[in-house]
Interface confidence: low
Amino acid sequence: GVTQTPKHLITATGQRVTLRCSPRSGDLSVYWYQQSLDQGLQFLIHYYNGEERAKGNILERFSAQQFPDLHSELNLSSLELGDSALYFCASSV
């Protein structure tokens, strides 16, 4: 299945964190979503085989990439209180 690390993260405002996602074996696509109490579930970004394919409601302070082994990282910088949320990764062929 899809593996995300870390499972939990507590940090301070202004900091930068990296969330990692390993897709299911053989899957080429990785999707990142943010679920917050006030905004609900929002699509952030989609990568296919290392290339950005679609961008959703992703802030300039957030960036992502997908590596040749297809794992992906979501970088959140200059963190604000409003960034407190669940971050989901999904994968597909």
């Epitope: 899957d27 080429l28 085989n49 290339e51 950005e52 590596f67 040749p68 082994d69 297809l70």
Partner: antibody, heavy 122, light 107 residues
């Protein structure tokens, strides 16, 4: 037909900069990553990293962080490699290469440029 | 990084002969090995990927075999245009790494 055509040979002194280009034709440029590979005289091939032609995001191998910059002129289907503060050990042939889009385990190169020889000498 | 060891470094043969080039990985790379041909002033040419899959347009006299750590490129019935440098490359994991090369010369 698919081609990657690289710029001509370069002669530079230590400390100077050089910018190499790689013009792609025969395919949709933004559908494939462009990689750079170094080959020092009499040596083997060493992968330098790649640039995502869709987003412009570069990724560098550990040994090529710092003085090496990958960039794009997407409208011209061209990828560039700039090397600053040149050193004698940068003397080499630099290849651009296209990676096939096969996904998992897909870090291979199905089309290559002809290579550019860069000489760094005082 | 995965280290790739190629052998032999040099190989002399005549047209019509068959030759084999070996490549050994420092750890298992499953089946994910590519072979390239290099000639001066020409773009490198992908011959084989996934250890044994022939790239489109490459003559069937080229074949690849092996999995895990040991791989072989075989050329049966050498043609004059086959002489040059050959490199293996693992495409199992980041970063991609190459063997040191094998020079195939005319005997």
């Amino acid at each position: 037909q698919i081609q990657l055509v690289q710029s001509g040979p370069e002669l530079r002194e230590p400390g100077e900069s050089v910018k190499l280009s790689c013009k792609a034709s025969g395919y949709t440029f933004t559908d494939y990553l462009v990689h750079w590979v170094k080959q020092a005289p009499g040596k083997g091939l060493k992968w330098m990293g790649w640039i995502n032609t869709y987003t412009g995001t570069p990724t560098y191998a550990d040994d090529f962080e710092g003085r090496f910059v990958f960039s794009l002129e997407a409208s011209a289907s061209t990828a560039n490699l700039q090397i600053s503060n040149l050193k004698n050990e940068d003397t080499a042939t630099y290849f651009c290469a296209r990676s096939w889009r096969r996904g998992l385990r897909g870090i291979g190169f199905d089309y290559w440029g002809q290579g550019v020889f860069v000489t760094v000498s005082s | 990084d995965v280290q790739m060891t190629q052998s032999p470094y040099n190989l002399a043969a005549s047209p019509g002969e068959s030759v084999s080039i070996n490549c050994k990985a420092s750890k298992s790379i499953n089946k994910y090995l590519a072979w390239y041909q290099q000639k001066p002033g020409k773009p490198n040419k992908l011959l084989i990927y996934d250890g044994s899959t022939l790239q489109s347009g490459i003559p069937s006299r080229f074949s690849g075999s092996g999995s895990g750590t040991d791989f072989t490129l075989t050329i049966r019935g050498l043609e004059p245009e086959d002489f040059g440098l050959y490199y293996c490359q693992q495409h199992n994991e980041y970063p991609p790494t190459f063997g040191a090369g094998t020079k195939l010369e005319l005997k």
